[in-house]
């Protein structure tokens, strides 16, 4: 259990300590305190480097001191013959004696007290990025105006995150731009546009000045753009090194500006706007797009009309055209629909006639109806030839879709009548 | 047929056989048979056969039987209480509408109707063919089809022949322009049982075809001159009747 103070005495003190002793004491004071260890009496066999008998003071892995011999106070007002101040809350004291003592030595008497440490000054590494405030048993960090203390309670940064930009056009700059940006900050800006618009970022070279990269090429301060699974950057240096126009192909963009503790520059300024998501002009054979444009963007609607003799088949129903919309993901709706050749189907049978099976029943195919000669003939003309028309009907040049009519040939006997002479 | 020769149905594929009364008719298309009014006036549901030279019962079983749907008698035909005493055969023409269409082939095919032009006006001496299973010189009814070629004659030739078994005064018999007189050569003539059959004349505009210029109607005496219904005078009535009683399938 940690204690605020305590006493440590060598074995048999104030009598002579025995030979061949090794004893250790673990001192622990509450966290946030250091330890002041002082000796009021010291009488230990003297040897070079205290090799025979000694009292050792260890802090962690470091030996703070090793004592032997006799000491007396230099100050008539103070009984302290030796003292140690450590800024840690743990300390180990080890007493060792060898196998023989030429004289009678009385050992040592020591006391420890918990002392306040000044974390703000006592360490090489400054605990706070900005202002350090010491108090008994601890310290706290504080920040200049407009800065806030991060969750680590040590670092200060500017409150530059959480902004969400939803307007179709806007401007974003680093904090204090064009004055130097704050050190030790992570600024996150979110652009969230309506689906169907892609964020396009525009920067001018002269509007960018960020602490340059180290010798290994790593940015110390950096600007990064993240759009979904795509990343642009990190960027740093004097003058913007990336493309001046960044087409993100996404409606959501995160801008992350990370700075370290040193080397603040003027920062950066950018403009962004939302471009309607483009849809590629797809190659749809046997069709015409209306309206015809060089570029199609989100919410554009086109009517795709099949050329004569072609149709789009959806759910086994044929149509000559369909509508397609440029969607928010940059893809066309109804993209599976295609204009395919019209199929006129199996030609109808006719009474007293026949139709030869065509090679194909698709647009442009030709069929020929014939009547059962010599007993029937084609009454309504047209020659019997039909082609598969664009409307899905078998059509004759004379009769249109009307089928030929095979009617009986009249008045023709198969064999002429011959009178038998009597 | 008196004075005729044996014929094959292939010579007269339009020939229709009526078994009650024993008579004839002419097929004019898939759905219609033309016959004499006096043939069907007493039996409005006649049984008809096509495609067979012989009308032997066993042969008829193998031939095509036609079922009537309706009989249309010319409105000018006078219906009598006692048909046996008839002296007026004017408008002796009727149409029989068939239930099902007839399939044409070498033994069954229609005869043409006369055109309305003057080309189809008959002249004396024009030859026509008659056929049927009616009385012959030897028997009351022929089993095999008989036929004869005979010329058109002036109507007076028919008037001059004495009626064999008159049922009234000779003057009572009516002769009209709706009748054709034909025969008088080598005793060739139609006779009882041939009624309704066609008097087939070669088409003046297409020598390969025959048209029904007349229908066997009546006569004063078999083996002399016979009277035939002049079909040309009824073409409008025939066309109108067929048109008004057709199905869309025929239109």
């Amino acid at each position: 259990e940690p204690t605020m103070y305590g006493e440590i005495l060598s074995p048999n003190y104030p009598q002579a300590y025995p030979s061949e002793v090794e004893k250790s004491w673990d001192i622990e004071v509450p966290e946030g305190y250091g330890i002041h260890l002082y000796f009021t009496h010291l009488d230990i066999e003297l040897s070079e480097n205290c090799a025979y008998d000694s009292v050792q003071i260890i802090s962690g892995d470091t030996e703070e001191g090793r004592l032997c011999g006799q000491r007396s106070s230099n100050n008539p007002h103070s009984p302290i013959v030796e003292e140690f101040q450590v800024p840690y809350n743990k300390l180990q004291v080890i007493f060792k004696s060898d196998f023989s003592n030429e004289e009678r030595f009385t050992g040592f008497a020591a006391y420890y007290v918990a002392t306040d440490i000044n974390e703000c000054t006592d360490f090489v590494d400054v605990p706070c990025s900005h202002f350090c405030n010491n108090f008994i048993g601890g310290y706290f960090c504080s920040c200049p105006p407009e800065y806030f203390l991060h969750d680590d309670m040590k670092n200060c940064g500017v409150n530059c995150s959480g902004d969400v930009f939803t307007a179709l056009i806007g401007e974003i700059a680093s904090p204090n731009y064009p004055k130097p940006y704050p050190e030790n900050s992570r600024c996150e800006y979110q652009i969230r546009l309506e689906k169907g618009f892609q964020v396009v970022v525009t920067l001018r070279r002269e509007d960018f000045d960020v602490e340059a990269a180290d010798s290994a090429g790593n940015c110390l301060d950096s600007l990064v753009f993240v759009a979904g699974d795509r990343q642009f950057g990190p960027y740093c240096g004097h003058g913007f090194p990336g493309p001046l126009n960044i087409e993100t192909k996404s409606n959501a963009l995160d801008i992350i500006f990370q700075t370290d503790l040193t080397g603040q520059k003027k920062g950066w300024k950018l403009r962004y706007h939302g471009d309607p998501m483009p849809c590629p002009k797809e190659d749809t054979p046997n069709s015409v797009w209306e309206p015809a444009k060089a570029k199609y963007v989100f919410r554009d609607v086109v009517q795709i009309t099949c050329l004569d003799g072609f149709e789009v088949v959806e759910g086994r129903v044929g149509a000559t055209s369909f509508y397609s919309t440029c969607q928010s993901n940059g893809k066309w709706s109804n993209s599976k629909l295609k204009c395919q050749p019209v199929d006129c189907g199996i030609p109808e049978s006719i009474e007293n006639g026949k139709v030869e099976d065509p090679e194909s029943t698709l647009f442009g195919s030709v069929i020929r109806y014939t009547c059962e000669e010599p007993y029937y003939y084609m009454e309504n003309g047209g020659g019997g030839e039909y082609h598969c028309a664009g409307n899905g009907s078998w059509v004759n040049e004379v009769l249109g879709p009307e089928l030929p009519k095979c009617v009986p040939v009249c008045g023709v006997p198969r064999e002429p009548f011959e009178e038998k002479q009597r | 047929i008196i004075g005729g020769s044996d014929a094959d149905i292939k010579n007269f594929p339009w020939q229709v056989f009526f078994d009650n009364p024993w008579a004839g008719g002419a097929l004019i298309n898939e759905y219609w048979v033309l016959t004499a009014a006096h043939v069907v006036e007493g039996n409005r549901e006649p049984t008809m056969y096509v495609g067979s030279t012989s009308v032997q019962t066993s042969r008829l079983a193998k031939s095509k039987m036609l079922t009537p749907e309706h009989v249309f008698i010319h409105p000018g035909w006078k219906l009598l209480e006692v048909p046996e005493g008839r002296t007026n055969f004017d408008n002796d023409i009727a149409l029989v509408r068939l239930k099902d269409p007839v399939k044409m082939g070498p033994t069954v095919s229609p005869i043409c109707l006369p055109g309305t032009s003057s080309d189809y006006n008959l002249m004396d001496g024009d030859l026509g063919l008659i056929s049927g299973w009616g009385r012959t010189e030897k028997r009351d009814r022929a089993v095999r089809l008989k036929a004869a070629r005979l010329p058109v004659a002036p109507l007076r030739k028919c008037k001059e022949v004495k009626v064999e078994k008159p049922t009234a005064d000779a003057e009572a018999y009516v002769f009209t322009p709706n009748m054709i007189c034909a025969g008088g050569e080598k005793g060739m003539d139609s006779c009882k049982g041939d009624s309704g059959g066609a008097f087939a004349v070669q088409d003046p505009n297409d020598k390969t075809k025959f048209y029904a210029a007349g229908l066997v109607s009546w006569g004063p005496q078999c083996g002399t001159y016979g009277l035939y219904t002049r079909v040309k005078n009824y073409v409008d009535w025939i066309m109108k009747t067929m048109q008004e009683n057709s199905t869309p399938r025929e239109d």
């Epitope: 086994r316 044929g318 189907g345 109808e348 049978s349 026949k354 099976d357 059962e372 899905g392 | -």
Partner: antibody
């Protein structure tokens, strides 16, 4: 007289095969497109397949496509339906029918019963 | 696929009454390709009316058919005992050759 006579039906286990025949007479068979239509017990009519007059074009119901094949032999005036991978739901009376103008079925056979059951 | 829906499923009427059978298509059908069949128990169907309004051979004139687009009707002006049967409508469309309605059973009341 037009006549269509079906044969080849019977009891078959699921997964089995049958070949139905339809003998035509009384008309020029090779002049007409033909169809098979089925009727499950107590149910309505369901078109199964159609074949063109010469036999080179066929259409089949989606649910039988790949399992059933319609064919014809014009020299024998016969229509066929080869049925493979039969299922219980194929149980029906199978009719053959002649296709007339506007693809109306003007003559039907009396049907042959196919029962698919284990 | 064009679906044909017939109504009513069953129609109970007495001889002499007028019968009206309806057939509704899920999308437009050409009137030339809409047909009706009559089927009696244990018998094969018979073509009854073809191309919407044309009576098949042997069908009495008390039967008539009408309609266009998606709505078609078979009417019997005065029912006779032999008319009681099941009637099916049927359509042909080149992209899906043939579909039938589920049938209307006309029964004696």
């Amino acid at each position: 007289e037009v006549m269509l006579v079906e044969s080849g039906g019977g009891l078959v286990k699921p997964g089995g095969s049958l070949r139905l025949s339809c003998a035509a007479s009384g008309f020029t068979f090779s002049n007409y497109a033909m169809s098979w239509v089925r009727q499950a017990p107590g149910k309505g009519l369901e078109w199964v397949a159609t074949i063109s007059s010469g036999g080179s074009h066929t259409y089949e119901l989606d649910s039988v496509d790949g399992r059933f094949t319609i064919s014809r032999d014009n020299s024998k005036d016969t229509l066929y339906l080869q049925m493979n991978s039969l299922r219980a739901e194929d149980t029906a009376l199978y009719y053959c029918a002649r296709l007339f103008t506007k693809h109306a079925m003007d003559y039907w056979g009396q049907g042959t019963l196919v029962t698919v059951s284990s | 696929q064009i679906v044909l829906t017939q109504s009513p499923a069953t129609l109970s009427l007495s001889p002499g009454e007028r019968a009206t059978l309806s057939c509704t298509a899920s999308s437009e059908v050409s009137s030339s390709y809409l047909h009706w069949y009559q089927q009696k128990p244990g018998k094969a169907p018979k073509l009854w009316i073809y191309s919407t309004s044309n009576l098949a051979s042997g069908v009495p004139s008390r039967f008539s058919g009408s309609g266009s687009g998606t709505d078609y009707t078979l009417t019997i002006s005065s029912l006779q005992p032999e008319d009681f049967a099941t009637y099916y409508c049927h359509q042909y469309y080149r992209l899906h050759p043939i579909t039938f309605g589920q049938g209307t059973k006309l029964e004696i009341k």
